[in-house]
């Protein structure tokens, strides 16, 4: 018996087609992805093959103005239109709190939404009861398939799930659900979830009875053969893990941003064992036409976005200096504003010992592309912010050793004076450079804001200590020559859309007046 699994993950509100790098589509003939194009391909496969499941492994939320405006209603609407069979909850589904998940998505989705390792407690337990499930058994052709969901247990540090959801260890939570399905004669089981490729592989290895793992969170690109675009494969598709009980378990992921549709064919024997698995992600490029009815619906929903981008978010009473002449050479108040917004967006998980889990921000000056003039009545709009941050990136959370941070700051000024983009703007950091010294030895003082303290203060950076830092995904991926970050980071979790972070902060503050205050000397 053969099953076709079509899968997406980390779509991050790319409802419209995008450019090859998943930013805003400029030249339509070269654009990719989007739900209208995805629908064309899905329907083509559904017509051609008998037993097809369309699955999403989480993080539909967050990433473009679509999410900022529609807050998840767009996800439910278009996933319903595409007739997804199931979705696992990702960490970003909690970005607007539990209410921001329940109302627009859980109550409106016409497909099961899954997570076996999220347990509700207190008053939320009855409110959320039945709105998401640990698993769902689906009839597919003449057989039944069990789909068990899971979500990153780091979600409380990455999003806003509140205090009434407990995120258990994925493997511990999955095993009893899989065991239960086995006793009920469900012998074909897919683990669908959002914890990253390393955890996906562990689930394949450790959870007895799981036949296939469909994952997300780490934006992993797997491919067998010559890859069709710019993404470099992290391994073959499917990636085969030998389980502790000796089975070969295929693990798949489909990069991110709706650029690819994962396509996996699994052959099962009559006892539900995987005999063979093969496939590849399908690049959703312009050779696949956009479905006209979905495209028309997208255009209808688009109208509200255009109106939103010119509305006032808040006011500035000072010039927001985002000029390259400032931000690539010295501390600039636009850099300070953005870093303050980045930290503010990550205020969570205070306890008796920590005022926050993260206090530091770094931001490449080259990523700041425009100033905002306060003389336009002080008005700041989404459109203004899109000029400052035009690349459609995210502000991510990484863990780095102090020694890596020191290297990053040396890199920041290794060729100072040439108006290059690697000059770092900061938050929660005081850095002093001596530019008379030779490159690689110019950082003379590097103090960082404590987190394990009731009164935050600046302490000298410790080379062997592990620090959490918020930074643009561009830097986490080694951009602007920050290879040491990419090579040495100990953990990387993708965060929220850059413009959204700053716009939320400005809306919250209402009036802003960031200063140059001696963070960089």
């Amino acid at each position: 018996w053969e099953l076709t699994i079509l899968h997406t993950n980390d779509v991050h509100s790319r409802l419209e087609q995008t450019s090859e790098d998943s930013s805003k589509c400029v030249n339509a003939s070269r654009c990719m992805g989007g739900v209208a194009r995805l629908f064309t391909k899905v329907q083509q496969i559904r017509r051609a093959e008998p037993n097809v499941l369309l699955l999403d492994a989480g993080d539909q939320y967050q990433g473009t103005i679509w999410f900022t405006v529609y807050k998840g209603a767009e996800v439910a609407h278009f996933m319903n239109a595409l007739r997804y069979d199931a979705m696992a909850l990702g960490n970003h589904e909690f970005d607007n709190g539990v209410e921001g998940l329940i109302e627009p998505l859980l109550k409106e989705a016409k497909f099961p939404i899954l997570s076996a390792n999220i347990k509700a407690k207190g008053p939320l337990a009855s409110q959320i009861s039945g709105l998401y499930l640990p698993y769902k058994v689906l009839p597919v052709g003449d057989e039944v398939v069990g789909i068990v969901g899971y979500t990153s247990k780091e979600t409380p540090f990455l999003s806003n799930p509140g205090t009434n959801l407990v995120f258990e260890d994925e493997i511990t939570a999955l095993q009893p659900e899989v065991d239960k399905l086995k006793t009920l004669n469900v012998n074909k089981i897919i683990a669908l979830g959002h914890s990253g490729f390393e955890t996906d592989k562990l689930i394949a290895q450790k959870v007895r009875g799981v036949d296939v793992v469909v994952g997300g969170h780490s934006n992993t690109f797997l491919y067998t053969g010559n890859p069709p675009s710019k993404e470099v494969p992290a391994g073959k598709y499917p990636f085969i893990v030998t389980s502790d009980d000796g089975r070969k378990v295929p693990v798949v992921q489909a990069y991110a941003f709706g650029k690819y549709l994962g396509y996996l064919k699994i052959e099962f024997d009559e006892r539900g064992n995987v005999i063979s698995s093969h496939g590849n992600p399908i690049l959703l490029n312009s050779s696949i036409p956009e479905d006209p009815s979905i495209k028309a619906d997208i255009n209808k929903w688009r109208i509200k976005l255009d109106n939103y981008s010119t509305q006032e978010l808040g006011k500035t009473i000072v010039y927001l200096d985002g000029s390259s002449q400032s931000c690539r050479f010295r501390e600039c108040n636009m850099g300070n504003l953005i870093c303050d917004a980045m930290i503010n967006n990550n205020l969570r998980h205070a306890d008796e010992m920590f005022w926050n889990h993260v206090s530091m921000c770094i931001l490449n000056g080259g990523g700041i592309r425009s100033p905002i003039d306060e003389r336009n009545n002080g008005t700041i709009t989404w459109e203004n912010l899109a000029a400052v941050l035009p690349f459609g990136g995210t502000f991510d959370l990484v863990q780095l050793k102090g020694s890596t941070l020191k290297k990053a700051f040396e890199h920041s000024v290794h060729r100072y004076g040439q108006s290059t983009g690697e000059f770092l703007q900061v938050g929660g950091i005081h850095v002093v450079y001596d530019l008379s010294r030779k490159p690689g030895d110019r950082v003379v003082k590097l103090d960082v804001l404590c987190t394990k303290c009731r009164v935050p203060s600046y302490d000298p950076l410790k080379m062997d200590e592990i620090y959490k830092v918020i930074l643009p995904n561009f830097l986490a991926n080694g951009g602007d020559g920050f290879q040491m970050i990419k090579d040495e980071l100990l953990r990387h979790d993708s965060g929220d859309q850059d413009i959204n972070v700053v716009s939320t902060y400005i809306s919250k503050m209402k009036v802003i007046y960031p200063a140059v205050e001696g963070r960089i000397k």
């Epitope: 559904r46 008998p50 037993n51 007739r83 016409k110 497909f111 099961p112 009861s129 039945g130 499930l133 640990p134 698993y135 769902k136 058994v137 689906l138 009839p139 597919v140 052709g141 003449d142 057989e143 039944v144 239960k180 399905l181 009920l184 004669n185 469900v186």
Partner: antibody
Framework: QVQMKQSAAEVRKPGASVKVSCKAS????????MDWVRQAPGQGLEWMGD????????IYNQKFKGRVTMTIDTSRSTAYMELRSLRSDDTAVYYC???????????WGQGTTVTVSS | DIQMTQSPSFLSASVGDRVTITCKAS??????LSWYQQKPGKAPKTLIY???RLIDGVPSRFSGSGSGTDFTLTISSLQYEDMATYYC?????????FGGGTKLEIK
């Protein structure tokens, strides 16, 4: 509005077969599975099976396996349930019911009475 | 197969009463439970699915609750037209199984 119209009552002798039809309207036929449920006189409801109109895939209750066949004709938006080797205890009202996205039955046909008597 | 035990099997109540019918599954059914109303000589009518979601057009006096193995159908203020037999169904796994029914009579 969603409607399921079933075929008329049938009388059969033991050992014979019966084929009940269920014509759906008011929705896209291939978007929802169809379940079949029966109810013997004065008794409760009993689930018989499920069919996917997209591909004809069926899941049967083991109790009826080998005796029941569910089919579809998408061009007519009609589902069929055939029960073979009829016995007197197969005398019942047979219902078709559409399932919603959650695979819960939501709209029901009016029922077809099948009487098995020698 | 999962067994569904409904109670009571017979219930007599007055118009305006709050009425509760319970359904117990032989094991956790993951909120995959629906409730049906059947009047004599008629086809069943779906009231609730996923334990607590009301089907469009069903009066709001009907509500469902519960999770795991224990589920409840509540009629907040009984009306004459609610006289019927009520069934629960688990659709968590195959085969789907119904409860034995609760016959509700108006005093």
């Amino acid at each position: 509005q969603v409607q399921m119209k079933q075929s008329a009552a049938e009388v059969r002798k033991p050992g014979a077969s019966v084929k009940v039809s269920c014509k759906a309207s008011g929705y896209t036929f291939t978007d929802s599975n169809m379940d079949w449920v029966r109810q013997a006189p004065g008794q409760g409801l009993e689930w018989m099976g499920d069919i996917n109109p997209n591909n004809g895939g069926t899941i049967y209750n083991q109790k009826f396996k080998g005796r029941v066949t569910m089919t579809i004709d998408t061009s007519r938006s009609t589902a069929y349930m055939e029960l073979r080797s009829l016995r007197s205890d197969d005398t019942a009202v047979y219902y078709c019911a559409r399932t919603n996205w959650d695979y819960a039955m939501d709209y029901w046909g009016q029922g077809t009475t099948v009487t098995v008597s020698s | 197969d999962i067994q569904m035990t409904q109670s009571p099997s017979f219930l007599s109540a007055s118009v305006g009463d709050r009425v509760t019918i319970t359904c117990k599954a032989s094991q956790d059914i993951n909120s995959q439970l629906s409730w049906y109303q059947q009047k004599p000589g008629k086809a069943p009518k779906t009231l609730i699915y996923r334990a607590n979601r009301l089907i469009d057009g069903v009066p709001s006096r009907f509500s469902g609750s519960g999770s795991g193995t224990d589920f409840t159908l509540t009629i907040s203020s009984l009306q004459y037209e609610d006289m019927a037999t009520y069934y629960c169904l688990q659709y968590d796994v195959f085969p789907r199984t119904f409860g034995g029914g609760t016959k509700l009579e108006i005093k």
